[in-house]
């Protein structure tokens, strides 16, 4: 048997119990709310900071690319890959055919001002894509040179030069004084590479990584 | 932490909270039911009030289905 | 719907479920306590057993802190 309690005490006990239980409920709900708020607000802030980052990234590129053409990568709405508007895209890169005639060094500088390099061709598929946009009666500088004239060809972006993935015209390269490479069309062999003097003005092809925002 | 990761972590927390509370609620509900039956047997319905009130609570839960 | 959007919807559902269940649990807890008191008054402690059992449940809940 429990000793008898006064009704007043019992009422007081019940009141305290109710207070404890509802306090616990309030605390639990507050914790839930905090969780839920964090789950809603943090992603919102995350999205906001992501948007801010994107805008600053875009502003960074806007200096030389006033407009970008973007496509959604995969299913996620978050990931967009962009190329500057007049540029063409292939795989993870953007390409620009410069029709101004400039020396090799000036062409490379011109590309780098746009955040790119003279084109580095890594595969036959890439070359096949590029030549679709070229004129047969023109020559275009590639990002390939041999400044020492010792036949140590090097790509502008430091990609290792792989003899097995080259598309020289037959008999090329053929002159130690011709230290820069172009891509041009020869009726006998179609499109291929040739070595020429670096100071001679030619058209050029710029290549840059796609801009991911 | 990335944005989706955070969401999944909070999902897990809310899910666990839901499970724990559901278990506690069911346990308490069963205790109340048992108590009501015991009370009825012992005092021939002295505690009909409790039984009724318990029944009301049961009705409420029946109508308020937890989300699937 | 994208994967993250789905996660937020699930968050909302679990959140609401958590709140509803918290309220129901607290309501039931208080009902049980009130019933115990009423029972005590009516039968001079015939239902001490119920009271004790309720107390145990209270102890359990006290120790089992809800996840932070």
């Amino acid at each position: 048997m429990v000793p008898e309690e006064e009704p007043q005490d019992r009422e007081k006990g019940l009141w305290w119990f109710q207070l404890k239980v509802w306090s616990m409920a309030v605390v639990s709900i507050l914790l839930l709310s905090v969780c839920f708020t964090v789950s809603s607000v943090v992603p919102h802030n995350f999205m906001y900071s992501k948007t801010v980052k994107r805008l600053s990234k875009l502003r960074e590129y806007q200096q030389y690319h006033p407009s970008l053409t973007c496509v959604m990568e995969g299913k996620d709405i978050e990931d967009w890959s962009c190329c500057p508007t007049p540029w063409t895209s292939f795989q993870s890169s953007c390409y620009f055919i410069s029709t101004g005639m400039q020396s090799w060094t000036k062409s490379q500088k011109n590309c780098s001002v746009m955040g790119a390099d003279l084109v580095v061709i890594n595969t036959r598929e890439e070359q096949d894509f590029i030549i679709q946009n070229l004129k047969r009666n023109s020559s275009y500088f590639l990002g390939l040179s041999d400044p020492g004239g010792r036949r140590h060809w090097q790509w502008v972006d430091q990609t290792p030069y792989n003899e097995n993935v080259t598309f020289w015209h037959s008999g090329e390269p053929n002159n130690l004084d011709e230290r820069c490479a172009i891509i041009n069309f020869r009726s006998s062999e179609e499109w291929g590479w040739n070595d020429i003097h670096c100071h001679v003005p030619q058209k050029s092809i710029c290549k840059m990584k796609k801009i991911y925002i | 932490l990335g944005e989706p990761q955070l969401c999944y972590i909070l999902d897990a927390i809310l899910f666990l909270y839901g499970i724990v509370l559901t278990l506690l609620y069911c346990r308490l509900k069963i205790q109340v039911r048992k108590a009501a039956i015991t009370s009825y047997e012992k005092s021939d319905g002295v505690y009909t009030g409790l039984s009724t009130r318990n029944q009301e609570t049961y009705e409420t839960l029946k109508h308020e289905k937890p989300p699937q | 719907l994208g994967e993250p959007q789905l996660c937020y919807i699930l968050d909302a559902i679990l959140f609401l479920y958590g709140i509803v269940l918290t309220l129901l649990y607290c309501r039931l807890k208080i009902q049980v306590r009130k019933a115990a008191i009423t029972s005590y008054e009516k039968s001079d402690g015939v239902y001490t057993g119920l009271s004790t059992r309720n107390q145990e449940t209270y102890e359990t809940l006290k120790h089992e802190k809800p996840p932070q």
């Epitope: 020396s103 090799w104 020492g148 004239g149 002159n175 130690l176 004084d177 020429i196 003097h197 100071h199 | - | -």
Partner: antibody, heavy 121, light 111 residues
Framework: EVQMVESGGDLVKPGDSLKLSCAAS????????MSWVRQTPDKRLEWVAT????????YYPDSVKGRFTISRDNAKNTLYLQMSSLKSEDTALYYC??????????????WGQGTTLTVSS | DIVLTQSPASLAVSLGQRATISCRAS??????????MHWYQQKPGQPPKLLIY???NLESGVPARFSGSGSETDFTLNIHPVEEEDAAAYFC?????????FGGGTKLEIK
């Protein structure tokens, strides 16, 4: 010893034509790009034409393009400059120079003694 | 075309002193580590003679008192100590792109 001797300079009238020659010796002529550079009466140096070692390319500044033609005869170790539609501003001392490529550019490491062209009515 | 501006147009330097000739290009004549400016000396009645190529490389047979420096658009030819036989005109030249161009020349006199 590297030697280059220019010849063919003369006094001509505006509109006339003239051919300059440069006989090279003391080096493997066919292996080098060659240029013509002129020095005007006010002592300014001005590039006139270039021919590549393989005879595959010829380059000219706009001021002479279409009027001057550079050529070479590797068998005779001789460089030529055919000039037509001559103007008074073509009056200068004409040097032939051997080109040496350095990185992406070139310089002239040997020069001939020069031959004088005067265009005057 | 790239315009090369030499300064001063003429200078007189005492024997044994330092002569400094400057050449400024209208645009960069450097590419990465390559500085494509060259210097020539021309004595009266003679053709130009190569002194320095690639901004700072001394041509073989040229005395070590000649030195060159610079990058991008600003280049300098130094002669120290100046000797009697250094009285001549000095020209800078670039050929990073066509047409290759020359500076207007600097006439050095020995006092």
């Amino acid at each position: 010893e590297v030697q280059m001797v220019e010849s063919g300079g003369d006094l001509v009238k505006p509109g006339d034509s003239l051919k300059l020659s440069c006989a090279a010796s003391g080096f493997t002529f066919r292996s080098y790009g060659m240029s013509w550079v002129r020095q005007t009466p006010d002592k300014r140096l001005e590039w006139v034409a270039t021919i590549s070692s393989g005879d595959s390319y010829t380059y000219y500044p706009d001021s002479v393009k279409g009027r001057f033609t550079i050529s070479r005869d590797n068998a005779k170790n001789t460089l030529y400059l055919q000039m037509s539609s001559l103007k008074s501003e073509d009056t200068a001392l004409y040097y032939c120079a051997r080109q040496i490529y350095y990185d992406y550019a070139y310089y002239f490491d040997f020069w001939g003694q020069g031959t004088t062209l005067t265009v005057s009515s | 075309d790239i315009v090369l501006t030499q300064s001063p147009a003429s200078l007189a330097v005492s024997l044994g002193q330092r002569a400094t000739i400057s050449c400024r290009a209208s645009e960069s004549v450097s590419f990465r580590t390559s500085h494509l400016m060259h210097w020539y000396q021309q004595k009266p009645g003679q053709p130009p003679k190569l002194l320095i190529y690639g901004a700072s490389n001394l041509e073989s047979g040229v005395p070590a008192r000649f030195s060159g420096s610079g990058s991008e658009t600003d280049f300098t030819l130094n002669i120290h100590p100046v000797e009697e036989e250094d009285a001549a005109a000095y020209f800078c030249q670039q050929s990073i792109e066509d047409p290759p161009t020359f500076g207007g020349g600097t006439k050095l006199e020995i006092k």
